[in-house]
């Protein structure tokens, strides 16, 4: 029998800057029941506080509700593991809520094949921001990324949509069934999970020649152009 091993706080995430949750990995248990407690203080303060909510985030977690979440303040936190033989301490983690935002996936993903008589056919993709995020306050800028692939293909094609909530794509394989997903990230923070996949059947007569692959803003009514490989590479590695 041994004291517990050193725990490790490995992740903190906020869905919207209003609340956040941190998770830890327990250390080795030493063969005895082990009790974990998370304590924290805000930078510039000396008063230590215990985790306000060990339940909401699931096992080995601490959830900070609205009344415990402050913007522009760094939280310094540590997990203590104790059993009958002694105690162990995690390294301290410094957390600024601004930089740990991971939004929920975008909502209401809709995909349509548009085949106007006088213009080239295209795939039109539209979505809504996640509900927990209030974009009106100006606290948030959400960036979006779309991925799509034929149902049986292994590789995804990825497009960066910037701040738009709709996007048009021309270069598709006729007759194929495509999966389409979208995700979002704040200007500082983490990509959301991908939204549930939406399926779309591309008609067999969805054709285009090479000259049509570059689409002008005018053709799209002021919408996003297909981005270059360079742009795609730059934006994809956030």
């Amino acid at each position: 029998q041994l004291p517990p091993g050193k725990p490790e706080i490995f992740k903190c995430r906020s869905p919207n800057k209003e609340t956040f949750t941190c998770w830890w990995r327990p250390g080795t248990d030493g063969g005895l029941p082990t009790n974990y407690s998370l304590t924290y203080h805000r930078e510039g303060e000396t008063l230590m506080h215990e985790c306000p909510d060990y339940i909401t985030g699931g096992p080995n977690s601490c959830h900070f509700g609205k009344q415990y979440t402050s913007m522009w303040r760094t939280y310094i936190m540590m997990v203590n593991a104790t059993n009958q033989m002694g105690s162990s301490f995690s390294d301290e983690l410094y957390v600024d809520v601004t930089y740990i935002v991971q939004p929920d996936p975008p909502l209401e993903l809709a995909v349509e094949v548009k085949q106007p008589e006088d213009r080239k056919p295209y795939l039109w993709i539209k979505w809504s921001p996640p509900t927990l995020i209030d974009l009106k306050t100006g606290w948030f800028t959400l960036l979006y990324e779309i991925r799509l692939k034929p149902e049986k293909a292994a590789e995804w094609e990825i497009h960066f949509a910037g701040q738009q909530t709709e996007f048009k794509i021309l270069s598709l394989h006729p007759g194929q069934k495509y999966l389409v997903q979208v995700r979002c990230k704040p200007d500082h923070g983490y990509w959301s999970a991908w939204s549930p996949a939406t399926f779309i059947q591309i008609p067999s007569d969805f054709t285009m020649n090479d000259e049509q692959k570059l689409i002008s803003e005018e053709d799209l009514g002021g919408e996003q152009k297909l981005i270059s490989e360079e742009d795609l590479h730059h934006h994809h590695h956030h």
């Epitope: 080795t28 002694g86 301490f89």
Partner: antibody, heavy 120, light 107 residues
């Protein structure tokens, strides 16, 4: 520049007491846990005792439990080791070492040591 | 307490050699392991922490690997300045323990 300077070592008879001090400079002392590590002549390193930043947790090696007491004075930027009931096997070079964090991590800075000799 | 066992106790090598020192823990310690270098008459100096992270200012010829109970320190190309004694130390529990040391000497 981080500096740790040990003092208080010397020749002492078995059963007697000695108090070691470690004066810290070049860093915010109360942001770090501190430790005593010893090395008997020609031997390896042995962790003696440690204390977290606010003295809220203290630990001792099995060989010194009940005889040695670690303490710190953050205002004076000092670490202490009160050694009672000294034995011949406590003869060693005693190092003061800084933990790399406030609680439990590796030792990133060491003093040059103070020699304690227990002999009649 | 957790026992740390280093091997070999002594290692004879030449400048330019690749040198590997092993450290075994008696219980799982995750990656909470540090390696120190000590030269005669000097205090130890940390080389590696968290099993494989190189301490700032330490030459890149030093590297660490392992997790759980088996760990290694590797010096990719031994330099004259590297002849010293090396210690592993676990900090998985508050009571720290060191290996008995490995002396790297000139062949």
């Amino acid at each position: 520049e981080v500096q740790l300077v040990e003092s208080g070592g010397g020749l002492v008879q078995p059963g007697r007491s000695l108090r070691l001090s470690c004066a810290a400079s070049g860093f915010t002392f109360d942001d770090y846990a501190m430790h005593w590590v010893r090395q008997a002549p020609g031997k390896g390193l042995e962790w003696v005792s440690g204390i977290i930043w606010n003295s809220g947790h203290i630990g001792y090696g099995d060989s010194v439990k009940g005889r040695f007491t670690i303490s710190r004075d953050n205002a004076k930027k000092s670490l202490y080791l009160q050694m009672n009931s000294l034995r011949a096997e406590d003869t060693a070079l005693y190092y003061c070492a800084r933990d790399s964090g406030r609680y439990q991590s590796y030792f990133d800075y060491w003093g040059q040591g103070t020699l304690v000799t227990v002999s009649s | 307490d957790i026992q740390m066992t280093q091997s070999p106790s002594t290692l004879s090598a030449s400048v330019g050699d690749r040198v590997t020192i092993t450290c075994r823990a008696s219980h799982i310690i995750s990656s909470w392991l540090a390696w120190y270098q000590q030269k005669p008459g000097k205090a130890p100096k940390v080389l590696i922490f968290k099993a494989s992270s190189l301490e700032s200012g330490v030459p890149s010829r030093f590297s660490g690997s392992g997790s759980g109970t088996e760990f290694t320190l590797t010096i990719s190309s031994l330099q004259p300045d590297d002849f010293a004694t090396y210690y592993c130390q676990q900090y998985n529990t508050y009571s720290r323990t060191f290996g008995q040391g490995t002396k790297v000497e000139i062949k």
